[in-house]
Each structure stands twice: as structure tokens, then as C-alpha cells.
Interface confidence: low
């Protein structure tokens, strides 16, 4: 299913974070929280779907705790009073590790998926349409929070694209929060009129099913590889591309290509067999000189989830992995609007693509 009319993502918001959910929660809304659990401080973090910013009315409190072997608390707070806890005595998060946390709002419940796997269902205790705010606090660093509204009419192909009906600023500025932590470049508030989120839904109401026999659907967000899609309007300064996924346990390599016709304007190629992140450009089937330097160790890890944020600027692409700036790549193909195709392939599972 394609998603459109979604609000722009919050990129690398500082924690604690509170942000508006434009239009409130709706049946079918999917909210993805991508980040990394901090390894140093604290034993808890929480994602709250709430009314307003006070924290007195929380429809869904999702609270992983690295205590007593690890467990996750789910609860609801009404008029400042907590209800009975629901505990899941399994911890799908790891300290120091990135995660992809997806909330699907449905008529009867929230479905929560962690790194592509259904983790818990939380049945509504209060009407979800009252929720207009998402907040995140605790020992976590955020890469992004994105919003995906299902179309009222299902269409194919799944990555059909529809522009926003209203221009939006990208990213919207979180209310009353401090600036981003060092290491992540500042947001560019230039207006963007088209943002497309490419997601996979197996079938209406069956997003997370994993039948024992080969099903006739994609059981949870898993993109066929290679994943290829158009970048509406091509690249331009301030244009962002977001991808998240999981590296396969036996991965050798994967690639993210930004293409212009038959040329690969930007080839991002993490190689686990060489412990390198190779960048290059291919013009008329000829590769240029590779760039491999990194400011820190290889950020991609076999078996671990990741997020990649590519920000186009006038002279270069800036690439951040798991919310941390990794490198700049100066444009070799400078006709940016013609760079209008994204190709992803190799030994990864994609869970989220936003162009």
C-alpha cells in the first residue's frame, strides 16, 4: 500500500522530545521511531502517545526497561493516574544498538513491531483519536520519527507516489526543544513539496502476519530486493532521503545508489568483507575513484538494524548513519534534478524508505 499526505518526519530530534501528530491518530496510521538505545546512561526509555504536552493523559505508554532481565511495560494514564501495567517479559532492544520501532494504529489496538517483527498488541483503553502528540524520553538517541498515512483507496504498485497537497517544511521544528546534539548536521528548513514514504503492507489488517505456510502476501515490511523507485523531482539542495533496515547476519555487501539515467551519481557500498564503506560514481559504466575514509569505525554491523539519512546540499551529499554524521560526498554529477532514481540492493532487509 502506498502512503501519502503524511506529515514530514522529525529528524534527529533531541531527547526528551515531544512533537505534534498532525491530524491526530487515525486508523491505519503507522509511526516509525528509529534510534539507538544508549549504552551508558539509564535503564529505561519510553514512547508515549498522548493528549497535549502535559503527560497527564497518555493513551499508550511503551516503556522498555533494562532491569530484572529486561521487560517492556505498556500502560495508559488518565488524568494523571496510571492504570494496570501490561508487561512483556521479553526485551527486543539491546543497549548500544540501533532499532526500528513501528507502531500501527488500528481500530481495536496498537500493533508494535520491533526490527520488523511483531512484538506486542496493546488494546485501546481510551479513544485513540484524542491523541495528538508523541513524546520520547529516557536513555535513547533518535534518528527520526516518521508518519505514514494509508490511502483511503488501496492502489498498486505499492510505491505509487502522490505529492503532498500542501507544501511542508522539512523537517518541522520540534516545539520548545534544544538543538540537536553535536555530530548531526542541522536541519534545513527549505520547503519541500513532495515527500514519499515507500512502505509495504501485506494486506489490509494483516500487516504483521507470518503464516507458517508460504503466504500470498508480504508478512511485515520487507521490500523485494533490489528496491528501485523514483525520486520525485530528483535531488536539490535540502532534499532528504531516509532509509532504514537490517543487515543480514551473513551479509557481505549492500549498496544504495542514487542514479541519473544510466549513470550512478552516488554509490554507497558498505562492504563487510572489507570492513569498508565505499563511495563512488559510475558514468557510462566507468567507475571513478573510490572514497573510503571514515571518521569512526564501520557503522554497519551484521545482523543489526540501521538508518541512513542522505541530505543533498549544493556542493555535496551529507550522509548520516544511525543519526550520526558519517561523511560528505562532493557531487561529481552536478545536474541534481536528473538524479531521480533510488536503487537499493544486497544483503539487507529494508524496512522503511522515504524519498
Amino acid at each position: 500500500m502506498a502512503f501519502s499526505g503524511s506529515q514530514a518526519p522529525y529528524l534527529s530530534p533531541a531527547v526528551p522530545f515531544s512533537g505534534t501528530i498532525q491530524g491526530g491518530l487515525q486508523d491505519g496510521l503507522q509511526i516509525t521511531v528509529n534510534g539507538t538505545v544508549l549504552s551508558s546512561s539509564g535503564t529505561r526509555f519510553a514512547v508515549n502517545f498522548q493528549t497535549g504536552f502535559s503527560g497527564n493523559d497518555i493513551a499508550f505508554h511503551f516503556n522498555p526497561r533494562f532491569e530484572d532481565g529486561g521487560y517492556v511495560v505498556c500502560n495508559t494514564r488518565q488524568n494523571g493516574s496510571w492504570g494496570p501495567e501490561e508487561r512483556k517479559t521479553h526485551m527486543p532492544f539491546q543497549k548500544g544498538m540501533p532499532f526500528d520501532l513501528c507502531f500501527l494504529v488500528q481500530s481495536s489496538d496498537f500493533k508494535v513491531m520491533v526490527n520488523g517483527i511483531l512484538f506486542v498488541q496493546y488494546f485501546h483503553r481510551v479513544p485513540f483519536h484524542r491523541v495528538d502528540t508523541i513524546s520520547v524520553n529516557g536513555s535513547v538517541q533518535l534518528s527520526y520519527i516518521s508518519f505514514q498515512n494509508p490511502r483511503t483507496v488501496p492502489v498498486q504498485p505499492a510505491f505509487s507516489t502522490v505529492p503532498f497537497s500542501q507544501p511542508v517544511c522539512f523537517p518541522p521544528r520540534p516545539r520548545g526543544r534544544r538543538q540537536k546534539p553535536p555530530g548531526v548536521w542541522p536541519a534545513n528548513p527549505a520547503p519541500i513539496t513532495q515527500t514519499v514514504i515507500h512502505t509495504v503492507q501485506s494486506a489490509p489488517g494483516q500487516m504483521f502476519s507470518t503464516p507458517a505456510i508460504p503466504p500470498m502476501m508480504y508478512p511485515h515490511p520487507a521490500y523485494p530486493m533490489p528496491f528501485i523507485t523514483t525520486i520525485l523531482g530528483g535531488l536539490y539542495p535540502s532534499k532528504s532521503i531516509l532509509l532504514s533496515g537490517t543487515v543480514l547476519p551473513s551479509a557481505q555487501r549492500f549498496h544504495i545508489n542514487l542514479c541519473s539515467g544510466n549513470h550512478i551519481a552516488f554509490h554507497l557500498n558498505p562492504r563487510f568483507d572489507e570492513n569498508a564503506v565505499v563511495r563512488n560514481t559510475q558514468i557510462d559504466n566507468s567507475w571513478g575513484s573510490e572514497e573510503r575514509s571514515l571518521p569512526r569505525k564501520m557503522p554497519f554491523v551484521r545482523g543489526q538494524s540501521f538508518s541512513v539519512w542522505i541530505l543533498c546540499e549544493a556542493h555535496c551529499l551529507k550522509v548520516a548513519v544511525d543519526g550520526q554524521h558519517l561523511f560528505e560526498y562532493y557531487h561529481r554529477l552536478r545536474n541534481l534534478p536528473t538524479i531521480n532514481r533510488l536503487e537499493v540492493g544486497g544483503d539487507i532487509q529494508l524496512t522503511h524508505v522515504q524519498t
Epitope: N115, G116, I117, Q156, P157, A158, F159, S160, V200, S202, A203, T210, P214, P215, M216, M217, Y218, P219, H220, A222, Y223, P224, M225, P226, F227, I228, T246, L248, P249, S250, A251, Q252, R253, H255, D273, G303, G345, G346, D347, Q349
Partner: antibody, heavy 129, light 108 residues
Amino acid sequence: EVQLVESGGGLVQPGGSLRLSCAASGFTVSYSSIHWVRQAPGKGLEWVASIYSYYGSTYYADSVKGRFTISADTSKNTAYLQMNSLRAEDTAVYYCARGHYQEGRKSGFSYWSPALDYWGQGTLVTVSS
Amino acid sequence: DIQMTQSPSSLSASVGDRVTITCRASQSVSSAVAWYQQKPGKAPKLLIYSASSLYSGVPSRFSGSRSGTDFTLTISSLQPEDFATYYCQQWYWYYPVTFGQGTKVEIK
């Protein structure tokens, strides 16, 4: 029971066109990957084209790119291979096959791969003057 | 494109023999390799996927393994119904998909 039945093969002159059909039953083409593979007489297997209907994604071997088009009619649960500008070297038995659904119970990574678990019986295409 | 070099092109063996067929990829293909069996006039049948996973319903005498860019199909004890042609296939980075040239297993 999963079944794939090809049809549409036959004798055609060089430069001519043919449309092969692959009628599927026992599964839904919309949510699967369908692949065409050919085998020239006495030769090995050659992958031709693939489609993931759900995503509108199509892929082609270099040898047929620009001449062949893979498509699917989900209402008929049928995939097609439209073959134009046919050449003598396109003579082969054409098989349609379904990609294997690889369920990653441990990794959580499940996908339709190009490992082909169900095949049709094949249809012969002869390009000759 | 990634090439799959299959060897031997043919072999003669007896019932009960252990048979090994190898495919070497021209570059790393991770574990994205499958093996098929084809009998004359019939469509191929999937035996192994992801280099070493036995496809449902395939006898356990068939096995697959990987060492770097070398992939091996082993038939631990050849049965009369196993005389056929075997193909390897790779899909690393998924497209283009390529097959090995085939190995014909004949009766000695």
C-alpha cells in the same frame, strides 16, 4: 495446490512477436514474484525476466531488455511475457516459475527470492524463417 | 554480471556413490545460491536455496554448502532417480540472475 501453466508458444518469424501467458493457481500472483526462464534446445537455463506485481517492479536480462516485457493481470492471476523483435537465438522452451518465499524465522527477514520453487511445464518458442 | 562456473560438466557414477558438484562464483554472492535438478523434457525442481537450506520435500541425501565463493551440492548416496542434470543459480544483488552451465549425472 500451486500450479503454473504456460501457453502462447509457437513458430514465429524473426522480427515477429509473441505473447506468452502463465496462468497461476493455488497462490496469488499479486503478492508473489514471477520469473521467466528459458532453455534453448540442448542448452542450459537462462533467466529472462522477473516481476513483483505488488511493487510494480520488473527486471530483465540484458539479452532481452527493450524487446521483452513482463507483466501481470492480477484479476486473472496470470503473468505474461510479451516478446517483440524476436531473433533466432530466442528459440527455447520458456518456463514461468514462482519465487520461493523465504521465511526468516530467526532473522525476521522474509522475502520472495529468485530461488524458484514452482515451475510450469514450459512452452516452446521457435523463431525461424 | 556474476558468472557461475559449474564443474564438472558431466560425471558418471553408480547407485550408492557420493556425488559432489561445485559452482564457483566470479565474485562474492553471499549465500544467494540455489540448486536445481532437471530431467529430460521436464521443468527443473528446486533442491537447495540460500546455499544450504533444503527445500521442503527434498530427500535429506541432498545437501548444499558454501566456502567463500565456492558452492557445493552433495548427494550422499546416489539413487536411481537422481540421474539428471543439476544447475546452480545465484541472485546476489538479485539481478541479473545467472545459472551455472549444468552438470549431467549419468549412470556408470
